[in-house]
């Protein structure tokens, strides 16, 4: 136990500050991007070095579900994450320096809403404070964007094509190519968040294969070309 090693805190005659929290009214970001929710605070315990907890919740103050929580040990500037919903929330600020700013990764439209920061001093100075009005996060929709398109070797000297796109709402993907009927049956893979992947399992002919991603905001296209070397019978491609 290291509790006997606590450091002394000098009394200062400076006037004590009141509890307050500073957050912007609104933060805007596009789906798929990251956003920072700023939150700074003042408190009356000028040299508080005891344990503390930083919390962010969504929906409503005091009662909304927590999306992020971290705790810092006495005298530590390291806030250990105890909760980060879907692993997408990360503390950017340093609570020991009155900053609870939060970064939210891989935004989806469903993340829109109000977020409330809260700090709890859990040591001798048992005290807590939470922003009442919070910060409103507006996540705007995003037109489709193809982030990766590739041809990969498949079984039995065949080839397959993969297309990954992002957008909000998640785009629908379709493959088209040189095969008769032109439009090929694509296996729509399970995406995560705003990303989706479609596979064309067997490329039977040489030529251009095009992946199209479309949602309510627009469409995007990207193509790959397959040209196989046709050697003597039995040779691999």
């Amino acid at each position: 136990d290291a509790s006997g090693d606590l450091l002394n805190t000098e009394a200062h005659s400076a006037p004590a500050q009141r509890w307050s929290m500073q957050v912007p009214a609104e933060v805007n970001a596009e789906a798929g991007d990251a956003a920072v929710l700023p939150c700074t605070f003042t408190h009356p315990h000028r040299h508080y070095d005891g344990p503390l907890t930083a919390i962010w919740r969504s929906g409503e103050p005091y009662a909304g579900p927590q999306v992020f929580r971290c705790t810092a040990a006495p005298g530590s500037e390291l806030c250990q994450t105890a909760l980060s919903l879907h692993g997408r929330f990360r503390l950017l600020g340093n609570p020991r320096r009155n900053d609870l700013s939060l970064r939210v990764e891989r935004l989806a439209l469903a993340d829109s809403g109000r977020y409330f920061c809260r700090v709890e001093f859990t040591g001798d100075a048992h005290d807590r404070y939470e922003s009442r009005h919070g910060v409103r996060l507006r996540v705007t929709a995003a037109a489709p964007r193809i982030v990766n398109i590739s041809v990969l070797p498949g079984p039995a000297h065949a080839f397959r094509a993969l297309c990954t796109a992002e957008g909000e709402p998640p785009p629908a993907l379709a493959w088209s190519g040189p095969a008769p009927g032109n439009s090929s049956a694509a296996l729509q893979g399970q995406g995560h968040g705003y990303q989706v992947t479609a596979e064309l399992p067997a490329l039977t002919r040489d030529g251009r294969y095009t992946c199209t991603a479309a949602n309510s905001l627009g469409r995007a296209e990207a193509s790959v070309y397959l040209f196989r070397f046709h050697g003597a019978p039995g040779t691999s491609t």
Partner: antibody
Framework: QVQLKQSGPELVRPGASVKISCEAS????????VNWVKQRPGRGLEWIGK????????YYNEKFKDKATLTADKSSSTAYMQLSGLTSEDSAVYFC?????????WGQGTLVTVSA | DIVMTQAAPSVPVTPGESVSISCRSS???????????LYWFLQRPGQSPQLLIY???NLASGVPDRFGGSGSGTAFTLRISRVEAEDVGVYYC?????????FGGGTKLEIK
């Protein structure tokens, strides 16, 4: 009580790498950053970087970003610093420091000598 | 990077007297929260550095109250009253307001 015990002296060839350790005891290792500091003979102190062993948050001094790699093993309460591409400029005593405010306790130092 | 300057490489002092060691920063170390992020360390000959003062004016655990820290946002003083033989060594200031943390060049306390 709080203790930081560092690995012993190292004599290494130019261009080689070395990994030095800092074993913590007497407090909850994952609750505090471990800082690393360089001191060349007769010179002052230089901050290399710090690692939060539990959250794997790492901050480097840009000057050492390509030189030092900080890691930590929670199970053994040990922080490590690997130094690569060693030259005579890297001959120094390296200290780890941790606990309250990141610098309340220091290891005894590890002397690294780079010589052909 | 914030540059920390300790102008005096050494200061001679007679045991029992008081001495002040100064340090300057190229930028104010006063944070908006009212804290000034400056440390003072003592490194005795052949030993590891030891924390004396944190946040400019707070005495670390186990440090005699003969030591005291004061200053403004950019000019800092470590004062040692009734200097003892065990106080000899090199005194370093260090800022930890911003990355990278930076140390002063050190001031050697020598007994006359």
């Amino acid at each position: 009580q709080v203790q930081l015990k560092q690995s012993g002296p190292e004599l290494v060839r130019p261009g080689a790498s070395v990994k030095i350790s800092c074993e913590a005891s007497g407090y909850t290792f994952t609750d505090y950053y471990v800082n690393w500091v360089k001191q060349r003979p007769g010179r002052g102190l230089e901050w290399i970087g710090k690692i939060g062993p539990g959250s794997v948050s790492i901050y480097y001094n840009e000057k050492f970003k390509d030189k030092a790699t900080l890691t930590a093993d929670k199970s053994s309460s040990t922080a490590y610093m690997q130094l690569s591409g060693l030259t005579s400029e890297d001959s120094a005593v390296y200290f780890c420091a941790s606990y309250y405010y990141g610098f309340a306790y220091w290891g005894q130092g590890t002397l690294v000598t780079v010589s052909a | 990077d914030i540059v920390m300057t300790q102008a005096a490489p050494s200061v001679p002092v007679t045991p029992g007297e008081s001495v002040s060691i100064s340090c300057r920063s190229s930028k104010s170390l006063l944070h908006s929260n009212g804290n000034t992020y400056l440390y003072w360390f003592l490194q005795r000959p052949g030993q590891s550095p030891q924390l004396l003062i944190y946040r400019m004016s707070n005495l670390a655990s186990g440090v005699p109250d003969r030591f005291g820290g004061s200053g403004s946002g950019t000019a800092f003083t470590l004062r040692i009253s009734r200097v003892e033989a065990e106080d000899v060594g090199v005194y370093y200031c260090m800022q930890h307001l911003e990355y990278p943390y930076t140390f002063g060049g050190g001031t050697k306390l020598e007994i006359k």
